[in-house]
């Protein structure tokens, strides 16, 4: 089969287009010439905002390591949104 396609059976008389993983899902196993893409749901703490045949789930940004706080929670399709900490003056 051509690049981007895979055999539909052992006989390989026919080929089908690799599928992509939808937003909220990441690639668990990249397709080969004889097998389709295997997708997995992004677990808590990870996200995918694209439809892709290659992209894995990405971890949420760690706001703390940037000395920021979480302004908007992440989902399986979106990253967290970080913002400045509100520092109270003494």
């Amino acid at each position: 089969c051509e690049e981007g396609w895979h055999c539909t059976s052992e006989a390989c008389e026919s080929c089908v287009l690799h599928r992509s993983c939808s937003p909220g899902f990441g690639v668990k196993q990249i397709a080969t010439g004889v097998s389709d893409t295997i997708c997995e749901p992004c677990p808590v703490g990870f996200f995918s905002n694209v439809s892709s045949a290659f992209e894995k789930c990405h971890p949420w940004t760690s706001c703390e390591t940037k000395d920021l706080v979480v302004q908007q929670a992440g989902t399986n399709k979106t990253d967290v949104v970080c913002g400045p900490q509100d520092r109270l003056r003494a």
Partner: antibody
């Protein structure tokens, strides 16, 4: 000679389900996926999805997830499509096709949804 | 989803003349493998669709060489030279590069 013989017309009531068939002959059934295509009266073509009889893998157009269920039976070389919770929007001719980009299509099954 | 646009719902033509049918896609149909997955089908009245042309310009088996296809990227054309009465029907373009596969709305060829 490759042939795809589809089941006859169906008149069904709103809310009901219907299951149509596509019997393949003239080739090794498990070597090709079977696609399904919808055509509403006087309108264009819409890809529903495919079933791979070799491993029962299915791939659906998101628009038809929950509406169409694609299956196959190796022993009879037949692919099936079941449509559920029918409405007037589901009234159409449904085609099966061995390889969407190939030359073998069934003659179509007309589904009419009417009270 | 990739949107396939066939701007002309119908084209009238006199037998023996030539006609062109256009199709545009909302994104490029060029795959990273170098192939462009654009197909043309003809649906004659009361019949199932039949493949005419694959990958822009490759004629399907049994299709007369009066039919030809051209284009690249997002713009494609089906040309029929010396139109015959048997050519009447609706012509559809289809993309096969990305799920879900999508068809144009069709262009009806009518004999004047």
């Amino acid at each position: 000679e490759v042939q795809l013989q589809q089941s006859g017309p169906e008149l069904v009531k709103p809310g009901a389900s219907v299951k149509m068939s596509c019997k393949a002959s003239g080739y090794t059934f498990t070597n090709y996926v079977m696609h399904w295509v919808k055509q509403k009266p006087g309108q264009g073509l819409e890809w529903i999805g495919y079933v791979n009889p070799y491993n029962d893998d299915t791939n659906y157009n998101e628009r038809f997830k929950g509406k169409a269920t694609l299956t196959s039976d190796k022993s009879s070389s037949t692919a099936y499509m079941e449509l559920s919770s029918l409405t007037s929007e589901d009234s159409a001719v449904y085609y099966c096709a061995r390889e969407l980009t190939g030359t073998y299509w069934g003659q179509g099954t007309l589904v009419t949804v009417s009270a | 989803d990739i949107v396939m646009t066939q701007a002309a719902p119908s084209v009238p033509v006199t037998p023996g003349e030539s006609v062109s049918i256009s199709c545009r896609s909302s994104k490029s149909l060029l795959h990273s493998n170098g192939n462009t997955y654009l197909y043309w089908f003809l649906q004659r009245p009361g019949q199932s669709p039949q493949l005419l042309i694959s990958r822009i310009s490759n004629l399907a088996s049994g299709v007369p060489d009066r039919f030809s296809g051209s284009g690249s990227g997002t713009a494609f054309t089906l040309r029929i030279s010396r139109v015959e009465a048997e050519d009447v029907g609706v012509y559809y373009c289809m993309q096969h590069v990305e799920y879900p596969f999508t068809f144009g709305s069709g262009t009806k060829l009518e004999i004047k």
